[in-house]
């Protein structure tokens, strides 16, 4: 059972355990060609140097070939995500060869030993690929290695060792422990394939990071900042999933990378977009929703190859389950003045009304404090497609930054009982859609009434002349 020392307890224990005396087992890597979408079908086992299974099992030399590479295992069995991914690949690419790399005996070890085995497994995959290259019509460019956790680094080794260049490697939350900060030849890196794309879903800057934090591909995508995944909180996990411990929260977040990739295969009509940004905080502020100069990309299988980029960090928000797609909006709110604000920090809430649907009331996350007489940028996202935005309802509440400030507020109120109400003055809201890249300006419905008190609402409609307002003297900051 998990140790009480946080969600990473078991793995932390594994990292510091003395090496156990193990019985000698045959080091084995097997290649199972999944010949059916049916997860119960045993498939075909390919054998290096034996062409008969290729013919018997209908290996298509001219088609795409996917190699799925699992990670470290505590149970010694294939995890449940595996046949989901197999099935999704078969659904999307009907003629493709889907090969599961079975290195369970070498992965069902102490974590440190499994890490040491990744090189051997990578070498086995490279040898299999070298052999396949000897066949007519087989192209390494059609090979896509998909590695989860420790399997992502196995894929890196395979790409490094193979004669030639693999078409693509997708790293699904590559393992962090013993790889963070490692030399490029000892972990997944952009040199390992023509295109290396990576999804990071369990990274932590404190404690043990199960997934690697550093960028290791041509594009590195950090859904929800790469750390806390929606639907994986302890409450969600206890309530609705086949898990019941903090350890399973870790599993949920780590495995989310696989499900995001599966989603990109099966929900092709609902692609999720990620946006290039220097860090998660800037993304949360909403200043990174640009698609200019290849700054945005689809995630997962639909990602566009950007060979020229290296270690391009990209971010997005997602839903808690499939389809994961959300709709991102940048909101620029110019706060012209505070009135009697004291030490109170405002929290804004918006409701978006569109041609297709209306949003719920959405809080605007404050990354830094609200600036007066300045344009403040926020990120909001909706789970449904609202269509073209028509109007926005804005409210705000005062949220004290500390108990001390709350006390000061209360004291101030008691000493000045006739203190006039607190107000903010907001005349317009500028909105940019991440998905459509459309920019719109929304003006206060009543230009003479642009002050708003806590709990009251202010309505904004599309300004008649688009992005800029007439007679607007304050400078506008161009969207990135």
């Amino acid at each position: 059972s998990p140790t009480p020392f946080g969600p990473e307890g078991q793995l932390a224990d594994e990292l510091h355990k003395p090496k156990a005396i193990q019985t000698e087992v045959k080091p084995s890597v097997r290649f199972n060609l999944r010949t059916s979408k049916d997860p119960e079908h045993e498939g075909c086992y390919l054998s290096l140097g034996h062409s008969q299974p290729l013919e018997d099992c209908g290996f298509n030399m001219t088609a795409k070939t996917f190699f799925i590479i699992h990670g470290w295992t505590m149970s010694g069995i294939f995890e449940n995500w595996l046949h989901k991914l197999v099935s999704a690949l078969h659904t999307r690419e009907k003629d493709a060869n889907v090969v599961v790399v079975d290195w369970l005996p070498l992965a069902h070890q102490l974590y440190t030993d499994a890490v040491n085995n990744t090189r051997v497994v990578g070498h086995s995959i490279a040898r299999m690929l070298d052999w396949l290259q000897e066949k007519d019509d087989f192209s390494l460019g059609n090979v896509h290695l998909i590695g989860y956790s420790l399997g992502a680094h196995v894929a890196g080794y395979a790409g490094n060792f193979v004669k030639g260049t693999v078409g693509r490697i997708t790293g699904l939350d590559p393992a962090g422990p013993m790889f963070e900060g490692a030399d490029i030849h000892k972990r997944l890196s952009p040199d390992d394939a023509d295109f290396v794309d990576v999804l990071h879903t369990y990274t932590r800057s404190f404690g043990l990071s199960i997934g690697i934090q550093m960028p290791v591909g041509h594009i590195d995508i950090y859904p929800n900042g790469g750390d806390f995944q929606p639907g994986c909180g302890l409450n969600d996990v206890l309530g609705s999933m086949a898990y019941g411990t903090i350890t399973e929260v870790v599993k949920c977040e780590h495995e989310r990378a696989v499900h995001l990739f599966v989603d990109s295969l099966v929900n092709q009509d609902k692609p999720s977009f990620a946006f290039q940004c220097t860090d998660s905080n800037r993304f949360k502020k909403g200043i990174c929703l640009s698609c200019r100069k290849n700054r945005c990309n689809s995630i997962g299988y639909n990602a566009k190859k950007m060979r020229n980029k290296r270690n391009s960090k990209m971010y997005l928000k997602t839903r808690a389950g499939m389809p994961f797609r959300v709709y991102h909006y940048q909101m620029k709110i110019h706060v012209f003045s505070y009135k009697n604000m004291g030490e109170i920090e405002p929290t804004f809430y918006v409701t978006l009304y569109g041609t297709n649907a209306d949003s719920q009331t959405l809080p605007l996350e404050i990354v830094e404090r609200i600036e007066q007489n300045a344009t403040n940028t926020f990120l909001v996202y909706t789970e449904e497609d609202l269509g073209d935005l028509l109007k926005i309802q804005l409210t705000w509440e005062g949220a004290s930054q500390s108990w001390y400030n709350l006390w000061k507020e209360l004291r101030s109120y008691l000493s000045q009982p006739h203190n006039p109400g607190r107000e903010l003055n907001i005349r317009r809201i500028r909105v940019k859609s991440g998905e459509t890249q459309r920019k719109l300006t929304f003006c206060a419905e009543d230009p003479e009434n642009t002050s708003i008190s806590p709990g009251r609402e202010l309505w904004f409609r599309k300004c008649r002349d688009g992005w800029r307002m007439k007679n607007e003297t304050s400078p506008t900051v161009e969207l990135p």
């Epitope: 119960e40 010694g76 449940n80």
Partner: antibody, heavy 120, light 111 residues
Framework: QVQLVQSGSELKKPGASVKVSCKAS????????MNWVRQAPGQGLEWMGW????????TYAGDFKGRFVFSLDTSVSTAYLQISSLKAEDTAVYYC?????????????WGKGTTVTVSS | DIVLTQSPASLAVSPGQRATITCKAS??????????MHWYQQKPGQPPKLLIY???NLASGVPARFSGSGSGTDFTLTINPVEANDTANYYC?????????FGGGTKVEIK
């Protein structure tokens, strides 16, 4: 057809050892894991563990660590269960059952069972 | 470990009637749209036989009188109509995680 043939009933004294065999036919032995399940008289089914028939790596359930050993002879497609230091409470029917490596891993083929009786 | 609780412990049914057995798991055995719950029949002196896999799929050679349903933590095995040779113990099993566990069994007798 696919079948698992187990060795015959055993009568043993406490402290002795027993080795039960399970011979597979009709399928590729190494393509499926082999489970061992115990059923004490009048009781339900209890999973003892399984062995990866390709690598030979065994996995034991909590109550079956120590005196119980799973092994293989892949040349004759046979799995073995050995129990040492037998106790009266080991009296049961022992079944081997195969499960796939992929998919939902249910037990689709069972041996007829081997009755092990431990009595002084 | 996931605990499976079967009810009733025993059941007496007349031929031609419906028999219903339920199995409740201590936590969900669903993974995405799949349920990792299976049902076995064990007749006296015989090994268990797979009846239903993944909650509702009929195993090869099993008559359509047997059906399974449910998701999450609650599952049902139905025999309709019951026949004389359905006298047996019936077990549910989960395989979403190791160790795979079995329910305590339901004894079905034909009146």
């Amino acid at each position: 057809q696919v079948q698992l043939v187990q060795s015959g009933s055993e009568l043993k004294k406490p402290g002795a050892s027993v080795k039960v065999s399970c011979k597979a036919s009709g399928y590729t032995f190494t393509n499926y894991g082999m489970n061992w399940v115990r059923q004490a008289p009048g009781q339900g089914l209890e999973w003892m563990g399984w062995i990866n028939t390709y690598s030979g790596v065994p996995t034991y359930a909590g109550d079956f660590k120590g005196r119980f050993v799973f092994s293989l002879d892949t040349s004759v497609s046979t799995a073995y269960l050995q129990i040492s230091s037998l106790k009266a409470e080991d009296t049961a029917v022992y079944y081997c059952a195969r499960r796939g490596y992929y998919g939902r891993r249910y037990f689709d083929v069972w041996g007829k069972g081997t009755t092990v009786t431990v009595s002084s | 470990d996931i605990v499976l609780t079967q009810s009733p412990a025993s059941l007496a049914v007349s031929p031609g009637q419906r028999a219903t057995i339920t199995c409740k798991a201590s936590q969900s055995v669903d993974y995405d749209v799949d349920s990792y719950m299976h049902w076995y029949q064990q007749k006296p002196g015989q090994p268990p036989k797979l009846l239903i896999y993944a909650a509702s799929n009929l195993a090869s050679g099993v008559p359509a009188r047997f059906s399974g349903s449910g998701s999450g933590t609650d599952f049902t095995l139905t025999i309709n109509p019951v026949e004389a040779n359905d006298t047996a113990n019936y077990y549910c099993q989960q395989t979403i995680e190791d160790p795979p566990t079995f329910g305590g069994g339901t004894k079905v007798e034909i009146k």
